[in-house]
């Protein structure tokens, strides 16, 4: 006899990184026939939704109209069919961004390099933070965490054409409160033409759409948005 139902999927739209005072929707997808969904925040019940009619709905949305540091943290959801509850979903780390200041991102030896050269990013922020995050925009999520008093060093090592793309960094005041994003730095890696095929880089997003794509903690859930894998959220734990 099955004691629990399969865990639901949880994700944030448009993104898990939410600028302060902007809106975000937490989505929880369970099964058709679920009569109740519960959203938990930091281990406590946060919201309840009872879809109608339950047999035609397998997803609910919890709307946060005004993101702030108190709403940032770890969310999970569960659902119920009859008297049977599901396993809890994976944890969704909801991050508030655009807090306080803007870091500066630089790259050594420069934004244009040859495949095989050693590259180091530097993220600098002159306010009270000691954790920094370097993110590469694109379909797959590349996130590094670094530490330093006012500056963190992100060594990429010898780069390949796969490292090409647009990078930004954040200062992190705690796991769920990040600074404004830095200005983007586009890394151009050219190969040795004789023996390197120039593979296309990850698709990148124009600066004005930064933060308008989806991150999900579930690798199996395919949406019509650009999909980031769960690396970013695992790094937060």
């Amino acid at each position: 006899q099955q004691q629990t139902l399969p865990k639901p999927f949880i994700w944030a739209e448009p993104h898990f990184m939410v600028p302060k005072e902007k809106q975000v929707t937490i989505c929880c997808q369970g099964n058709y026939g679920a009569v109740e969904y519960q959203l938990h925040f930091e281990g406590s019940l946060f919201a309840v939704d009872r879809p109608k009619p339950p047999e035609r709905i397998n997803k609910v949305q919890f709307y946060i109209p005004d993101m702030n540091s108190r709403m940032a943290g770890q969310y999970s959801c569960i659902y119920r069919v009859g008297e049977l509850w599901s396993e809890p979903s994976n944890l969704l780390d909801l991050v508030v961004t655009e807090m306080y200041d803007t870091p500066t991102l630089s790259v050594h030896p420069g934004p244009e390099v040859i495949s095989g050269e050693k590259v180091t990013f530097y993220c600098r922020l002159d306010t009270a933070t000691s954790m920094f995050l370097l993110l590469k925009e694109g379909r797959s999520s590349h996130v590094q965490r670094g530490y330093g008093k006012v500056q963190a060093e992100f060594p990429l090592g010898p780069v390949t054409t796969a490292h090409r793309g647009t990078y930004r960094c954040f200062g992190s005041y705690n796991n769920h409160a990040w600074s404004f994003p830095s200005e983007p730095v586009k890394l151009l890696v050219t190969g040795d033409i004789e023996n390197t095929s120039l593979a296309p880089e990850d698709p990148t997003f124009p600066a004005d759409t930064w933060g308008t794509y989806l991150l999900t903690t579930e690798t199996g859930l395919q949406k019509d948005h650009a999909l980031w894998d769960h690396t970013a959220q695992n790094l937060l734990r």
Partner: nanobody
């Protein structure tokens, strides 16, 4: 302390060649990267060429590609820049720089002036 000393600058006619040298006071074979930069009057410093130590990977700025060649002789602890087909816009102070670890340009020379003029 490490010292970098450039030489070989001077006045040269357009289309001619010149070779710059950069002598290092320390041993360079373990240094990750060495490079040449230049600064034209009233402009910022820009990279001209750089060379990685162990892999010998060479990078050239687009404006000098095909005309300039960077090389290094670790036995002599010297970096070279062979400049050919020189143009008036190559006029600048040329600096040698050393990056010992791959993280930052640690040391800089004082510079040598190259003037391309007819």
């Amino acid at each position: 302390d490490v010292q970098l000393v450039e030489s070989g600058g001077g006045v040269v006619q357009p289309g001619r060649s010149l070779r710059l040298s950069c002598a290092a006071s320390g041993r360079t074979e373990s240094w990750y990267r060495m490079g040449w930069f230049r600064q034209a009057p009233g402009k910022g410093r820009e990279v001209v060429a750089r060379i990685s130590g162990d892999t010998n990977i060479k990078y050239y700025a687009g404006s000098v590609k095909g005309r300039f060649t960077i090389s290094r002789d670790n036995s002599k602890n010297t970096l070279y820049l062979q400049m050919s087909s020189l143009r008036a816009e190559d006029t600048a102070v040329y600096y040698c720089a050393a990056d010992r670890t791959g993280a930052t340009w640690d040391y800089w020379g004082q510079g040598t002036l190259v003037t391309v003029s007819s």
